[in-house]
């Protein structure tokens, strides 16, 4: 095959090699970019910046090598369009630093940075951590910081992500109130900060205020839906990102719902209770307090993380006709109380007769177990918990 005269030449089925001295100053408009899985670039001293737009359209790229070139700067979002990138070799360039954001979101198996005039500062704390943790083949490179020494020796005591403190109101918050939250950000080299409010939806009207180092957030006209919803403050510096989530408790009165009893492993009278703070519960049976036992007890389902409503069952272990009746669930919190009732019938009464009527007794003369003409008692597996006096 004739030698390829272009700046970049195909290599294998989905690779491209760009090795002609000084032919590139950017990676725009590479031929066949959308199908490339491998890109090898060498001796491109004019290629000094790698930015978001350079790798747009290279969605299949897995291996990127830019070596012995003039690369001085890689943008934090440079690899946004190459999520499949697993090997990145940027050795023997002019890189002094590389942001933690550049590799965030990638699953790099290999990151090669040797031969760059790296400069040690907190901005390389993430890379030092990779070295400590044996990630990406970094330890084998024994990276040096230009003018200083091994990256491994860089002091890191002051290299922390931002510290966040979110102040929430101490006082009780009621439906319809306006709530002011403040996020205090501390730390060196603060770059960006903000709020994540994706869970809030229609729970309140949101107004943001202020900026670093103190961010304000007003939640106006809050609803009870705000409960259990995360309000997250985040901040970034050259070391990394920190997030702190808080929840605002909006007080509202207890409410309760009961549903028809269903037979499962045990019988279950399903219920739902809501309220903030969480209401206390009490069951009544036919108007009297029901004391729970190992046969009759309240069981809650696993609560949903983002809502106050609790679902559960009054569990009844093999109930009989004596458990038939009216069940009432009382729920109360400081802001109100509620109740709901339901009739439950688990079993017909096998002794449904008038006490004045004669009691029918069956004799079984063929029963060999019976040594006399006494009535044979058939023991039912279900304990009735009731005694019948025969007069």
């Amino acid at each position: 095959a004739a030698p390829c005269p272009d700046a970049c030449c195909p290599h294998g089925s989905s690779g491209l090699r760009c090795t002609r001295d000084g032919a590139l100053d950017s990676l725009h408009h590479l031929p066949g970019a959308e199908n490339l899985t491998e890109l090898y670039i060498e001796n491109q001293q004019h290629l000094q910046h790698l930015e978001l737009r350079d790798l747009r359209g290279l969605g299949e790229l897995r291996n990127l090598t830019i070596v012995k070139s003039g690369l001085r700067f890689v943008a934090p979002d440079a690899f946004h369009f190459t999520p499949r990138l697993s090997r990145l070799n940027l050795s023997f360039n002019a890189l002094e630093s590389l942001s933690w954001k550049t590799v965030q979101g990638l699953s790099l198996q290999e990151l090669v940075l040797s031969g760059n005039p790296l400069h040690c500062s907190c901005a390389l704390r993430w890379l030092q951590r990779w070295e400590e943790e044996g990630l990406g083949g970094v330890p084998e490179q024994k990276l040096q910081c230009h003018g200083q020494g091994p990256l491994a020796h860089m002091p890191n005591a002051s290299c922390g992500v931002p510290t966040l403190k979110v102040q929430v109101p101490n006082a009780s918050v009621d439906v319809g109130d306006d709530v002011l939250l403040r996020c205090q950000v501390e730390g060196r080299g603060l770059e960006q900060a903000g709020w994540i409010l994706t869970e809030l939806e229609q729970s309140a009207t949101v107004m943001k205020s202020g900026g670093l180092p103190s961010l304000g957030l007003t939640l106006a006209n809050v609803t009870s839906d705000l409960n259990r919803k995360n309000v997250t403050c985040w901040a970034e510096n050259d070391v990394g990102r920190a997030e702190v989530s808080v929840q605002v408790n909006v007080s509202f009165p207890a409410s309760v719902q009961l549903h028809t009893a269903v037979e499962m492993h045990h019988w279950c009278i399903p219920f739902s209770v809501d309220g903030q703070p969480a209401p206390s519960l009490r069951w009544l049976f036919n108007g009297s307090v029901l004391n729970e036992t190992s046969f009759i007890f309240t069981e809650f389902l696993e609560p949903a993380a983002n809502e106050t409503v609790r679902h559960g069952c009054l569990r009844l272990n093999q109930p009989t006709h004596v458990n038939n009746g009216n069940y009432t669930l009382l729920a109360a919190n400081p802001f109100g109380q509620a109740s709901a009732s339901i009739m439950a019938a688990f079993m017909d009464n096998p002794f449904e007769f008038n006490p004045e009527d004669p009691i029918p007794v069956s004799f079984s003369p063929v029963d060999t177990n019976s040594t006399s003409g006494d009535p044979v008692e058939k023991k039912d597996e279900t304990p009735f918990g009731v005694s019948v006096a025969v007069g």
């Epitope: 907190c122 901005a123 003018g147 020494g149 020796h153 005591a157 002051s158 060196r188």
Partner: antibody
């Protein structure tokens, strides 16, 4: 103990060059970056550049790029700083200093070499 | 380049006084160094990465700060402490020094 001993004072004419030496002892010369810093009379400290004796890697301050050359001789554990096209404002005391990576600072300094540029 | 601004540029104090020198960086830095220099001598390292005492440095010297604002404190000034003090950053190339603070006898 660790020591850096510099060459003696120099008087030069404008346009000439000067080469200052810095002999290291008491440690492995090739393992630590050597830096050069200068101080004009009555002024503050100004960084010139650095060399890694292990492989001759260098970095220079933008201001001195093209005029300064840092070299080393590992056989004698000596670092050199050569400054060309001298002008009167290059009159200063020139220091070599080792960057001690174990504690991450310039821990040992030479005694200084006075370079006077005068016609 | 990151600019380092020291204040005051000079101060007069008596033996036993508590002395505070501040250094402000033009942008946030990772850590700071302090040097002491006496006339005709090379700078002597006092404090490295912000608050660690250099070898043989008396405990009356202390350093603190973060971000852009840093402080060198001498808790009880001694006769041998009369000198010029320099701060230095190396968060990014090139390393830069403050203009110096001369501590003189009152």
């Amino acid at each position: 103990q660790v020591q850096l001993v510099q060459s003696g004072a120099e008087v030069k004419k404008p346009g000439a060059s000067v080469k200052v030496s810095c002999k290291a002892s008491g440690y492995t010369f090739t393992e630590y970056w050597m830096h050069w810093v200068r101080q004009a009379p009555g002024q503050g400290l100004e960084w010139i550049g650095t060399i890694y004796p292990g492989n001759s890697d260098t970095s220079y301050a933008q201001k001195f790029q093209g005029r300064v050359t840092l070299t080393r001789d590992t056989s004698t554990s000596t670092a050199y700083m050569e400054l060309s096209s001298l002008r009167s404002e290059d009159t200063a005391v020139y220091y070599c200093t080792r960057f001690y990576f174990e504690d991450w600072y310039f821990d040992v300094w030479g005694q200084g070499t006075t370079v006077t540029v005068s016609s | 380049d990151i600019q380092m601004t020291q204040s005051p540029s000079s101060l007069s104090a008596s033996v036993g006084d508590r002395v505070t020198i501040t250094c402000r960086a033009s942008s946030s830095i990772s850590w700071l160094y302090w040097f002491q220099q006496k006339p005709g001598k090379a700078p002597k390292p006092l404090i490295y990465y912000t608050s660690s005492l250099g070898s043989g440095v008396p405990s009356r010297f202390s350093g603190s700060g973060s971000g852009t604002d840093y402080t060198l404190t001498i808790s009880s000034l001694q006769p041998e402490d009369f000198a010029t003090y320099y701060c230095q950053q190396w968060h990014s190339y090139p390393p830069t020094f403050g203009g110096g603070t001369k501590v003189e006898i009152k």
